[in-house]
Amino acid sequence: AVDLTLLANLRLTDPQRFFLTCVSGEAGAGRGSDAWGPPLLLEKDDRIVRTPPGPPLRLARNGSHQVTLRGFSKPSDLVGVFSCVGGAGARRTRVIYVHNSPGAHLLPDKVTHTVNKGDTAVLSARVHKEKQTDVIWKSNGSYFYTLDWHEAQDGRFLLQLPNVQPPSSGIYSATYLEASPLGSAFFRLIVRGCGAGRWGPGCTKECPGCLHGGVCHDHDGECVCPPGFTGTRCEQACREGRFGQSCQEQCPGISGCRGLTFCLPDPYGCSCGSGWRGSQCQEACAPGHFGADCRLQCQCQNGGTCDRFSGCVCPSGWHGVHCEKSDRIPQILNMASELEFNLETMPRINCAAAGNPFPVRGSIELRKPDGTVLLSTKAIVEPEKTTAEFEVPRLVLADSGFWECRVSTSGGQDSRRFKVNVKVPPVPLAAPRLLTKQSRQLVVSPLVSFSGDGPISTVRLHYRPQDSTMDWSTIVVDPSENVTLMNLRPKTGYSVRVQLSRPGEGGEGAWGPPTLMTTDCPEPLLQPWLEGWHVEGTDRLRVSWSLPLVPGPLVGDGFLLRLWDGTRGQERRENVSSPQARTALLTGLTPGTHYQLDVQLYHCTLLGPASPPAHVLLPPSGPPAPRHLHAQALSDSEIQLTWKHPEALPGPISKYVVEVQVAGGAGDPLWIDVDRPEETSTIIRGLNASTRYLFRMRASIQGLGDWSNTVEESTLGNGLQAEGPVQESRAAEEGLDQ
């Protein structure tokens, strides 16, 4: 069972002094979101008993193993159900405390009732303040039963629950009709999942015979020991004022465990600490009684005296629960109450005994849960004891359970049961996870879900190149940290597997499933430099670069050109996918923009060093195209062009450019400037007769604009061959010749 105790301080004169403390003896308990699981939770459960809202309760954590609830302002704040949750995973356990108001109309004779499946449970509510009206019993907040007030027996209202089953478990209350629920008697009924003395699926297994009021857990057969007792069967008393599964906790305050209620995991429930009784656990046990709630009787023999915390204290020469055994009777000494081994190991178990006559090797035997008896292989005889050593055959899961060491001599016999837990070494259920990779290293997360038992003591990472027959490389790592595999080969697949271990001999589990992790390519090391660049238009740029000459093959798949537009905060990336390329045309750029330009070699997904940057200013874009361009032949060597100014100009036009080309001709076109921007007509002279020409034009502001539509026109016939076209413009509005 989980080592979890909920303590309630019942010194109730002042509710503000009331507190609840939850203490965990579990390894790593309450450490929060670390590898070992969730923290301790302590809260009031308002689902069944609702009290008037008040200021919120204060929760204080005292280290990792303890949490305390304070801040109760009035007695009604205390009434109801409180719960503490601790332990991780499948071991997560809820411990419940039910608080009754000392001034209630009805009070429970006993708050916690633990019964076996099929038993009859009897809940008894004692009349504290009489009301001559019906009593309503509720189960988990819902109506259950009614009693007429005449049905009280000796000032008590009894609820009989025959043949109880586990679903009958829960919070029961007895309330006078039309009285405040805070005046109710609240009970907790715990129904074990098995009949008396049995546990396990199908209730086929026998309980170990828990002593001193311990209760056998119906799931795992362990004894949940009352506060103040320890051992597999609760056979050992703790020192006064101590509690916890190993007596490791100490009651706070100078009066020890007085005034404290202890609640433990089901099926134990709650009780006073050892040596105390009463509704507020403030009364010491009467002579001859001891233990939690003083429920146990000493009945000491042979001059033993009764200690209210531990039971019979025997005079020398006697031992046993009632001092009924003579020291001549052999006695098993210092047997651990619980041992843990890993599956398929062959452990050695020691069992020591003393007595008169002295036990010898053959008089000590070891009995397994299935009844098999093992004889010792050797014995060490010392003046005060004999220690027999047993070599246990290879352990299987069925060996889990209660083993027994037995000593028999002519003076009598003694036996001691102890629990053996056979644990399954952990086996990863998944492959490790790749976090990041480089050319020569892989960063791996090794901790994965696993089957079998924890805790994980070590994690081994095994790795080797894929399809290799070489030995595996192994690295031992911390379970909670990521691992870097170093000195690997670039661009290589590695098979990686995890192996988990738990403490103890044979705790190494089988290797987990493999996963393939591939290192990255080698990083390209060469730094290109920009040879030059030139603008091929307002939005086009040709760039060329070089690489240093080095021996051996070039490590790279291509180049990445980057253009940074600082004004707009935008980056343009151009991929050149040939490592042989040394030039590239960048198009679709933004005219009039100042760019920073660099180039890098890349290989796979890795980038080499960038070239020193260059700063390039693209010319701004020109104006829109002139409109309605029209050509009209005037003679055998002249054609007149007319047009309209472009619309939505970004500024004043500096000139027009006319392009003249012979239709179907193979030569370069001729560009002629019209230097007076106000012109809307010009005459192109010096043309050949009877020749078909193509014309188009564009305007210029700071840069050249878009071309207009192309127009065709033929000169008139039979003139002389001209020297070449020239131009005469006319300002339509002024009528000037040029």
Partner: antibody, heavy 121, light 109 residues
Framework: EVQLLESGGGLVQPGGSLRLSCAAS????????MVWVRQAPGKGLEWVSS????????YYADSVKGRFTISRDNSKNTLYLQMNSLRAEDTAVYYC??????????????WGQGTLVTVSS | QSVLTQPHSVSASPGKTVTISCTRS????????VQWYQQRPGSVPTTVIY?????PSGVPDRFSGSIDSSSNSAFLSISGLKTEDEADYYC???????????FGGGTKL
């Protein structure tokens, strides 16, 4: 589903006897207090008698005390009303009802359809 | 034994709010919880309010109950009246001394 079904009503002469039954289903009958309530033609509701879950304690309206007896058989999930020395003013529809407890008060949460008792010569 | 007195009938128009009173003749109205039942013509009674002011599930929030100690009365209010609300309404309380379940005379709405 909770169901209450009355039977045993009919015509009876003054001074005569009649036994009403109420068969219950759909809930743990042995845990609930049960009552008989009647309603004379064109009149209001009148509580007649109640019986506690154990059957050990019973209560009656003054108008029927000494003449009517309420009982229950928890093994058969049945409630009874034995009516003796019947009078004309006992003519009514007789309902059996279950008492439930919302918070800490009781109220009649399920009613049968009723059975008519007519006392007439 | 105390008596619970209700008006014989009340009437109101659809959509309006109506309040039915239930006055206790002796003893404090607040010392016992009051329940209200609705009985439509030809039907069995059903609970609309229990414990003075609590509604069973399924009862619309147009129905509300209250207690007024100064007039020693309990009240049932129905807002947004619908024709389906036309019925007899009974108040009821418990006499803890005699163990009697006491009904009011009923109010026809």
């Amino acid at each position: 589903e909770v169901q209450l079904l009355e039977s045993g009503g009919g015509l009876v002469q003054p001074g005569g006897s009649l036994r009403l039954s109420c068969a219950a289903s759909g809930f743990t009958f042995s845990h609930y207090m049960m009552v008989w309530v009647r309603q004379a033609p064109g009149k209001g509701l009148e509580w007649v008698s109640s019986i506690y879950p154990s059957g050990g304690w019973t209560y009656y309206a003054d108008s029927v005390k000494g003449r009517f007896t309420i009982s229950r058989d928890n093994s058969k999930n049945t409630l009874y009303l034995q009516m003796n020395s019947l009078r004309a003013e006992d003519t009514a529809v007789y309902y059996c009802a279950r008492l439930d407890y919302g918070g800490n008060s009781a109220y009649f949460d399920y009613w049968g359809q009723g059975t008519l008792v007519t006392v007439s010569s | 034994q105390s008596v619970l007195t209700q008006p014989h009938s009340v009437s109101a128009s659809p959509g309006k709010t109506v309040t039915i009173s239930c006055t206790r003749s002796s003893g404090n109205i607040a010392s016992n919880f009051v329940q209200w039942y609705q009985q439509r013509p030809g039907s069995v009674p059903t609970t609309v309010i229990y414990e003075d002011d609590r509604r069973p599930s399924g009862v619309p929030d147009r129905f509300s109950g209250s207690i007024d100690s100064s007039s020693n009365s309990a009240f049932l209010s129905i807002s947004g009246l619908k024709t389906e609300d036309e019925a007899d309404y009974y108040c009821q309380s418990h006499d803890r001394t005699t163990r009697a379940w006491v009904f009011g005379g009923g109010t026809k709405l």
